[in-house]
Amino acid sequence: VEVQVSEDPVVALVDTDATLRCSFSPEPGFSLAQLNLIWQLTDTKQLVHSFTEGRDQGSAYSNRTALFPDLLVQGNASLRLQRVRVTDEGSYTCFVSIQDFDSAAVSLQVAAPYSKPSMTLEPNKDLRPGNMVTITCSSYQGYPEAEVFWKDGQGVPLTGNVTTSQMANERGLFDVHSVLRVVLGANGTYSCLVRNPVLQQDAHGSVTITGQPLTFPPEA
């Protein structure tokens, strides 16, 4: 028997369902009584789900997994993982045994989009050209860690005087805070881009200083 899985990682959003695809080619006359199917975590060998002795043995992994019972006889050994969490990330191995056996591993990459950044300034009033200001860009509840890029109004990257920190929360998601210290010109726009490297999702925030007063662009 030959087992086939996707070579590319499966990307799943936190709190959504994911399908880890695994298939085999059943011989003519194949019946489910002949099938032994085991899904396990590749590295720790922890059992996730199994089908043996002609029946679904159920989930051994936080009761959030399921097979596709009606499709097993056609060679579809895929695993459904419900309400994906950060802790689910990793490699899963699909073992199929009929008369001989084969196995293959598929990787699950978990992701969560970052929120639209909020922008704050310090100081936020009586600003004059030549003043040093601190602009903070904050974006929340993403996974994995974000990349942050700053640009001025002409699109020129701002890399000096930038400090970015990631903060992990109880669910394993990250809040990102990036601080730009800059000397104000007569007027100007400063924008930050928070990128989720897995989703290639960009979240933008910007602040514009046009003499007085200070203005924030409207929400997109």
Epitope: P9, D43, E89, S107, E145, S165, A168, G172, P197
Partner: antibody
Framework: EVQLVESGGGLIQPGGSLRLSCAAS????????MSWVRQAPGKGLEWVSS???????FYADNVKGRFTISRDNSKNTLYLQMNSLRAEDTAVYYC??????????????WGQGTLVTVSS | EIVLTQSPATLSLSPGERATLSCAAS???????LHWYQQKPGLAPRLLIY???NLASGIPDRFSGSGSGTDFTLTISRLEPEDFAVYYC?????????FGGGTKVEIK
């Protein structure tokens, strides 16, 4: 059995470059965040850099712009390219595997380390 | 950056005694993201306790951890000869991910 084996350390002059390697085995390397942590002689541990499974990298401020972390998932190998080396970069460099969120991102396996000495 | 200050720097005790090591954070750290490592001379660090109080695989139960907020403690109930080493706390709550300066537990 999980194994991490560093190599590439040595004596280098200030301003010089060096590339460290870390060969990983016994686990699915491509799915883990990997890090470099260093330890100056007689001192404590200092995080240097981390790289996500897909290649996105993060650095400590004191190495940003000089060091580049990378990985080759097909070769199960982690790298650290170190340029513009300074005397204060002298340390044993360890590669470490960051465990998943069920262990709250602790570094559960470490290599034996490779010594980098920056001196004229 | 979160600074972790370990005390004492050196702890001189005899086998069989109880060891209490402290780790103080400059700002609050989620107890989930506070870890402890053990390092013996010439060897790499090894994970001892994760998330303040959970023993890593293969670590004997004479080791325990506690604490919250800014104050964390590692306790070794009865020191065995192999426990004499340097111990580091680490936080993964906020980048840059930082380590304490270490506490050396030496034989009295």
């Amino acid at each position: 059995e999980v194994q991490l084996v560093e190599s590439g350390g040595g004596l280098i002059q200030p301003g010089g470059s060096l590339r460290l390697s870390c060969a990983a085995s016994g686990f699915t390397f491509s799915t883990y965040v990997m890090s470099w942590v260093r330890q100056a002689p007689g001192k404590g541990l200092e995080w240097v850099s981390s790289i996500l499974s897909g290649g996105t990298s993060f650095y400590a401020d004191n190495v940003k712009g000089r060091f580049t972390i990378s990985r080759d998932n097909s070769k199960n190998t982690l790298y650290l390219q170190m340029n513009s080396l300074r005397a204060e970069d002298t340390a044993v460099y360890y590669c470490a595997r960051r465990y998943g969120h069920d262990h709250y991102y602790a570094m559960d396996y470490w290599g034996q380390g490779t010594l980098v000495t920056v001196s004229s | 950056e979160i600074v972790l200050t370990q005390s004492p720097a050196t702890l001189s005790l005899s086998p069989g005694e109880r060891a209490t090591l402290s780790c103080a954070a400059s700002s609050s750290v989620s107890s989930s993201y506070l870890h402890w490592y053990q390092q013996k001379p010439g060897l790499a660090p090894r994970l001892l306790i994760y998330s303040t109080s959970n023993l890593a695989s293969g670590i004997p139960d004479r080791f325990s951890g506690s604490g919250s907020g800014t104050d964390f403690t590692l306790t070794i109930s009865r020191l065995e000869p192999e426990d004499f080493a340097v111990y580091y706390c680490q936080q993964y709550h906020r980048s840059p991910w930082t380590f304490g300066g270490g506490t050396k537990v030496e034989i009295k």
